[in-house]
């Protein structure tokens, strides 16, 4: 029971985590314009992995995709790659873990096979979570570096009295979503690995004991008991649950208000 709960919880936590990684990857707010100690602009800039957006104080938002592949910074490409690898591994892990769930019966699958699948999915979730955390952390590091570089020359003279304000970027919501999601996927993976230990059939080799009856000789071999009877699979009492994994197709974003003045 505890094993089933651990496995089920691990699956659910990982599912939430992977959904979060997907959401973070798609989000536009990886970096947002720093409003602190900055001249108050009627334009708010924010950037994602795939496009950059400008929200005007009039309420209009314009987003432009990065239509170049070679012109993008190597770090951004690396972050994209890490996030995609994380999503792919997580998705495969979810697929594997569905079949590995103790509460789902598929044919005459051995517990050892389920244990192996649980371990595989657990490792996949761990790697997926690490990829997401790494990707978000690389991006965050890039932001911090750029932030201090732009702070050093925040106001650059444009000949005479005219000044140009350099836009500084700080951590966007997607970074926090990514960190949390990566962490959840990692935790889910660890839980799956723990559940795997409980699922693995313990190979206890008892010596075959012979009982001699008066009429004829019958040998009971406890070692082969599980395989010979139907009790190992508990087919009578098993409730088969259809894994109804819900996916959220749409993340509704409400316009956040920035009171600039």
């Amino acid at each position: 029971m505890a094993v089933t709960a651990c496995q089920g919880l691990g699956f659910v936590v990982s599912l939430i985590g992977i959904a979060g990684i997907i959401a973070a990857t798609c989000m536009d707010q990886w970096s947002t314009q720093d409003l602190y100690n900055n001249p108050v602009t009627a334009v708010f800039n924010y950037q994602g992995l795939w496009r950059s957006c400008v929200r005007e104080s009039s309420g209009f938002t314009e987003c432009r995709g990065y239509f170049t592949l070679l012109g993008l910074p190597a770090m951004l490409q690396a972050v994209r790659a890490l996030m995609i690898v994380g999503i792919v591994l997580g998705a495969i892990g979810l697929l594997v873990s569905i079949f590995a769930l103790k509460c789902i019966r598929i044919g005459s699958m051995e517990d050892s096979a389920k244990a192996n699948m649980t371990l595989t999915s657990g490792i996949m979730f761990i790697v997926s979570g690490l990829c997401a955390i790494a990707g978000v952390s690389v991006f965050a590091n890039m932001l911090v570096t750029n932030f201090w570089m732009s702070t050093a020359n925040m106001y650059t003279g444009m000949g005479g009295m005219v000044q140009t304000v350099q836009t500084r970027y700080t951590f966007g919501a997607a970074l926090f979503v990514g960190w949390v999601a990566g962490g959840l996927t990692l935790i889910g993976g660890v839980m799956m690995c723990i559940a795997c230990r409980g699922l693995a059939p313990e190979e206890t080799n008892y010596k075959a004991v012979s009982y001699h009856a008066s009429g004829h000789s019958v040998a009971y071999k406890p070692g082969g008991f599980k395989a010979s009877t139907g009790f190992g699979s508990n087919t009578k009492n098993k409730k088969i649950y259809d894994g109804g994994a819900r996916t959220e197709d749409e993340v509704q974003s409400y316009p956040s208000k920035h009171d600039y003045v």
Partner: antibody, heavy 118, light 113 residues
């Protein structure tokens, strides 16, 4: 056709209050913020602030905080600006203007003249 | 606050003449996010409200004659009227649409000789 119809001229005594209206038609009223602009004796224009009719959020310039108050009535697609504690400095023509892409004011009301005189 | 300086304050021209109005900002109005200059030009004819002519420094508002052209970047902007018509006699205002509070220039009055 987009139209912004403002209320008629006002003659007020110092210390009094005045409420100017701006009725919008020809577009989705809640889809655009409404700006208010002051023009003293035909000279330059001065931005007072704006209101988002959808959320009711208001933005005021420092100078007009406490002086001007924006409100909206979405059922009648009307924006209002109230000016308190009037002085001769408040004598001007006040415009409402729709806020659009590029932070522009693309449609303007005809203006409401406010005269403060004892 | 951002100071918008327009020059000249008034200009007397003849019909058909090419006119260039200048507008300088105390800070750059270029937004790095979309590489657009948040400068707007308005025309105000006598007894009328202002009318939007140009936004994003060079984008002509629909219905505005092609003789009106906006140019410039950063903090230096110009409005050019290629061939002045009688109906162009008005006051022209430039506006900072990038920094709060939104500020207007003092205006350039265009008069016919």
């Amino acid at each position: 056709e987009v139209q912004l119809q403002q209320s008629g001229p006002e003659l007020e005594k110092p210390g009094a209050s005045v409420k100017i209206s701006c009725k919008a038609s020809g577009y989705s009223f809640t889809g655009y913020k409404m700006n208010w602009v002051k023009q003293s004796n035909g000279e330059s224009l001065e931005w007072i602030g704006n209101i988002d009719p959808y959320y009711g959020d208001t933005t005021y310039t420092q100078k007009f905080k406490g002086k001007a108050t924006f409100t909206v009535d979405t059922s009648s697609s009307t924006a209002y600006m109230q000016l308190k504690s009037l002085t001769s400095e408040d004598s001007a023509v006040y415009f409402c203007a729709r806020y659009n892409r590029g932070n522009t004011m693309d449609y303007w009301g005809q203006g409401t003249s406010v005269t403060v005189s004892s | 606050d951002i100071v918008m300086t327009q020059s000249p304050s008034s200009l007397t021209v003849t019909a058909g003449e090419k006119v260039t109005l200048s507008c300088k900002s105390s800070q750059s109005l270029l937004n790095s996010g979309n590489q657009k200059n948040y400068l707007t030009w308005y025309q105000q004819r006598p007894g009328q409200p202002p009318k939007l002519l140009i936004y994003w420094a060079s984008t002509r508002e629909s219905g505005v004659p092609v003789r009106f052209t906006g140019s410039g970047s950063g903090a230096d902007f110009t409005l050019t009227i290629s061939s002045v018509q009688a109906e162009d006699l008005a006051v022209y205002f430039c506006q900072n649409a990038y920094f709060y509070p939104l500020t207007f220039g003092t205006g350039t009055k265009l008069e016919l000789r």
